[in-house]
Interface confidence: low
């Protein structure tokens, strides 16, 4: 069937339109175009005879039409009057005629719109504003934008006049925004420039800052006032009802008790004519006395005495506060406060209770601190320590031992050998020792104030032969890439060389291996699984040597990224799927499987008999090592094909 298609259907003035003919019959004599829905000689635009390829203009020809051999008609420089129907009359060679009608619409290119307003400075909660989109244009649609968003749903927003007018009832400060209007027709869309709505509002109730209402005599008073307002508010200050100044800030230096009273800030908006006030009551306090601490025991004995600290002076209706080490009092059954908090009692003092202690008197405004007080707690002596820690010495060297015990006042020291008193000094020195100097060396520490004494005994061996050493470790199960391990060769011996072997080889050069403490300590930083070897230490001097038993390092590692085998990812329907997962790990990891994210079983092997295309998906193996706290996983895609096809295995 003969049809006419208009391209485009909606045409802008000045543009062109093509009336495209479809299903043109064969064996044509010619054709003719008419304006309107029927063949009317008075409204003929153009005729065309195929044999002569001759086009003949008709009465309705405007000079803007071009007819093509395929009967299509192009109309250029479209005007408004071109809107409507167009009829094609086709004359076939057998003189049987056919007709078809098409149509298009013409619309003007819209001008850029603008916004007019009936009120440029509306007052909040009082005025309405009507925006109108200019100019008024026929067959145009009007749209509105607020801050480049479409209009919000609000009972205060009303569209009228075919959406050309936007009315905001009872404007608020939140209506201060960018407004745009847009005109649209089927061939164009234009948006106006922004119009900013300037809503007059306020002043709101002013706020006075800072909020602080209590001051100390001698301080400066600096109050600031602010009220939300458009245009900005004008401010006035009143003290006890008396006008002070017309500023936003009020400053009074070096205030006294006489400056106590009510302070009023008044905010005024000259455009809205509104006033709002806020009142704050300021209280100025006199300076209180500085407190100090008294103690009932200036030299208490550790674990025996109690100490009562009292905050002076005593003032009625006053709050007393305490601090220890610049912190508020810790919760402790050994700390007790009196009912008025003025006395702090320390029950059974310890050496850690030295302080410093401070007390404070709190008035309405601030807290005044005392000077700090430190307790002289008598303690000790603790068990003395004898240094150096060597227990083996070679004959002929000098023996020099030193003793120390924590004590207040400092301890007095005595030395005994095999129970016999030697001397009353902190250090014991014996030159050119022999095997006869072997024995029990005792240090006794005495506190003259508490009368307490403590002793420590050390066995000293003088011998040319070295003992069999042993290895101690600070970490028996280090985690790979995380922990360090320190091996120490025991015992500590004087004038002795320490040696180390790993798997029977001398130490390799490595930035992760470090010798210290006279080569007596071997530290492995950031251990790896390759460090799980046998370590041996040796000691030697000029007359003997000895080796320790080996110590094997048990490094926890993994799990590494698992490997799923076999590597095949394509299977035929009906086959058995047997996937095995393996991950290097110490200790052995726990395994679990997920298919398409759904947990399956906690085994190393996943077996599914007689798989089908329903078993397509992602197969994930998860491994976790409870000792290292680490996890790992790998995902494999499995494709199952119907039995008739033979897919190639993918890598």
């Amino acid at each position: 069937k003969l049809t006419i298609e208009s391209t485009p259907f909606n045409v802008a003035e000045g543009k062109e339109v093509l009336l495209l003919v479809h299903n043109l019959p064969q064996h044509l004599f010619g054709y003719s175009w008419y304006k309107g829905e029927r063949v009317d000689g008075n409204r003929q635009i153009i005729g065309y005879v195929i044999g002569t390829q001759q086009a003949t203009p008709g009465p309705a020809y405007s000079g803007r039409e071009i007819i093509y051999p395929n009967a299509s008609l192009l109309i250029q420089n479209i005007i408004q009057n071109d809107t409507g129907f167009y009829t094609l009359h086709v004359i076939k060679s057998d003189l049987v005629n056919e007709e078809a009608t098409g149509q298009f619409r013409v619309y003007p290119e819209l001008p850029k719109p603008s916004i007019s307003s009936n009120n440029s400075k509306p007052v909040e909660d009082k005025d309405a504003v009507a925006f109108t989109c200019e100019p008024e244009t026929q067959d145009a649609t009007y749209l509105w934008w607020v801050n480049n968003q479409s209009l919000p749903v609000s009972p205060r927003l009303q569209l009228s006049n075919g959406n050309r007018t936007l009315t905001l009832f009872n404007v608020t400060r939140n209506d201060t925004a960018s407004y745009k209007c847009e005109t649209q027709n089927p061939v164009s869309a234009r948006r106006s420039d922004s119009v900013i709505l300037n809503v007059l509002y306020g002043p709101d109730a002013p706020t006075i800052s800072p909020l602080n209402t209590s001051y100390r005599s001698g301080e400066n008073l600096n109050l600031s006032c602010h009220a939300a307002s458009n245009p900005p508010a004008q401010y006035s200050w009143f003290v006890n009802g008396t006008f002070q100044q017309s500023t936003q800030e009020l400053f009074i230096p070096n205030i006294t008790v006489n400056n106590s009273g009510s302070y009023t800030c008044q905010a005024h908006n000259s455009d809205t004519g509104l006033n709002r006030t806020t009142v704050t009551t300021i209280t100025v306090y006199a300076e209180p006395p500085k407190p100090f601490i008294t103690s009932n025991n200036s030299n208490p004995v550790e674990d025996e005495d109690a100490v009562a600290l009292t905050c002076e002076p005593e003032i009625q209706n006053t709050t007393y506060l305490w601090w220890v080490n610049n912190q508020s009092l810790p919760v402790s059954p050994r700390l007790q406060l009196s009912n008025d908090n003025r006395t702090l009692t320390l029950l059974s003092v310890t050496r850690n209770d030295v302080g410093p202690y401070e007390c404070g008197i709190q008035n309405e405004l601030s807290v005044d601190h005392s000077d700090p007080v430190i307790l002289n707690v008598l303690y000790g002596p603790d068990d003395p320590t004898i240094s150096p820690s060597y227990t083996y010495y070679r004959p002929g060297v000098n023996l020099s031992l030193s003793c120390h015990a924590a004590s207040n006042p400092p301890a007095q020291y005595s030395w005994l050998i095999d129970g016999n008193i030697q001397q009353h000094t902190q250090e014991l020195f014996i030159s050119n020792i022999t095997e006869k100097n072997s024995g029990l060396y005792t240090c006794q520490a005495n506190n003259s104030a508490s009368g307490h004494s403590r002793t420590t005994v050390k066995t000293i061996t003088v011998s040319a032969e070295l003992p069999k050493p042993s290895i101690s470790s600070n970490n028996s199960k280090p985690v790979e890439d995380k922990d360090a391990v320190a091996f120490t060769c025991e015992p500590e011996a004087q004038n002795t060389t320490y040696l180390w072997w790993v798997n029977g080889q001398s130490l390799p050069v490595s930035p992760r291996l470090q010798l210290s403490n006279g080569n007596r300590t071997l530290t492995l930083f950031n251990v790896t699984r390759n460090d799980a070897r046998a370590y041996v230490c040796g000691i030697q001097n000029s007359v003997s040597a000895n080796r320790s038993d080996p110590v094997t390092l048990d490094v926890l590692y993994g799990p590494d990224t698992p490997i799923i085998s076999p590597p095949d990812s394509s299977y035929l329907s009906g086959a058995n799927l047997n996937l095995s997962c393996h991950s290097a790990s110490n200790p052995s990891p726990q395994y679990s499987w997920r298919i398409n994210g759904i947990p399956q079983q906690h085994t190393q092997v996943l077996f599914i008999a007689k798989i089908t295309p329903n078993n397509n998906g992602t197969y994930a193996c998860f491994v976790s090592n409870l000792a290292t706290g680490r996890n790992n996983s790998i995902v494999k895609s499995i494709t199952v094909s119907a039995s008739g096809t033979s897919p190639g295995l993918s890598a």
């Epitope: 590494d560 990224t561 490997i563 590597p567 398409n596 397509n616 998906g617 992602t618 895609s637 993918s650 890598a651």
Partner: antibody
Framework: EVQLVQSGAEVKKPGASVKVSCKAS????????MNWVRQAPGQRLEWMGD????????SYNQNFKGRVTITRDTSASTAYMELSSLRSEDTAVYYC??????????WGQGTLVTVSS | EIVMTQSPATLSVSPGERATLSCRAS??????????IHWYQQKPGQAPRLLIY???NLETGIPARFSGSGSGTEFTLTISSLQSEDFAVYYC?????????FGGGTKVEIK
């Protein structure tokens, strides 16, 4: 922050080979597959292949008929792509891309390879 | 291999307008409920940047005006309100089967 830094631009003659490197940082190199994608002028992006840095396993686009080889050096956290038997149509920007969430999550800055006689 | 077809080749849009880009796969790229299709943005002289993964998941740091939808073989990338920095070429990628393949791209240009 994940970063992939590629080697500089190369000019090669037809028949020669080119090897582009991609150094990774900001994540564990062996945990994620590394892919290579190229983009010839005016053409769509074309996936060339990938490597699992942990075990060295590779997959390739058969359109390259065995001309592409992808390798890695885990100690240097670096992946390499070598393309042999170069022809003029191999002129392209070559990208490395880290594989995550079933897609190319992070890309290198690209390396321009020009093949010209 | 799976052939990815994007349309239109060029899309002219004004800033603030909505843009809708299409991507069609020659066969299904879904597997067990997951759509293995991803969208990338590329600007001149830069590497592609991942916007959407698994058809509809927004990559970290990508603005919410980008969204993806679709399943099976038909997928759509939508930019709700185009910003100046969004004018670029957009590619879809399928990772359902090796070789992974990209669409020919849609260039989004300023109208």
């Amino acid at each position: 922050e994940v970063q992939l830094v590629q080697s500089g631009a190369e000019v090669k003659k037809p028949g020669a080979s080119v090897k582009v490197s991609c150094k990774a940082s900001g994540y564990t190199f062996t945990d994620y597959h590394m892919n290579w994608v190229r983009q010839a002028p005016g053409q769509r992006l074309e996936w060339m292949g990938d490597i699992n840095p942990d075990i060295g396993g590779t997959s390739y686009n058969q359109n390259f008929k065995g001309r592409v080889t992808i390798t890695r050096d885990t100690s240097a956290s670096t992946a390499y792509m070598e393309l042999s038997s170069l022809r003029s149509e191999d002129t392209a920007v070559y990208y490395c891309a880290r594989w995550d969430f079933d897609s190319f999550a992070n890309w290198g800055q690209g390396t321009l390879v020009t093949v010209s006689s | 291999e799976i052939v990815m077809t994007q349309s239109p080749a060029t899309l002219s849009v004004s800033p603030g307008e909505r843009a809708t880009l299409s991507c069609r796969a020659s066969e299904s790229v879904s597997i067990i409920g997951t759509n293995l299709i991803h969208w990338y943005q590329q600007k001149p002289g830069q590497a592609p940047r991942l916007l959407i993964y698994h058809a509809s998941n927004l990559e970290t740091g990508i603005p919410a005006r980008f969204s993806g939808s679709g399943s099976g073989t038909e997928f759509t990338l939508t930019i709700s309100s185009l910003q100046s920095e969004d004018f670029a070429v957009y590619y879809c990628l399928q990772s359902r089967k090796i070789p992974y393949t990209f669409g020919g791209g849609t260039k989004v240009e300023i109208k």
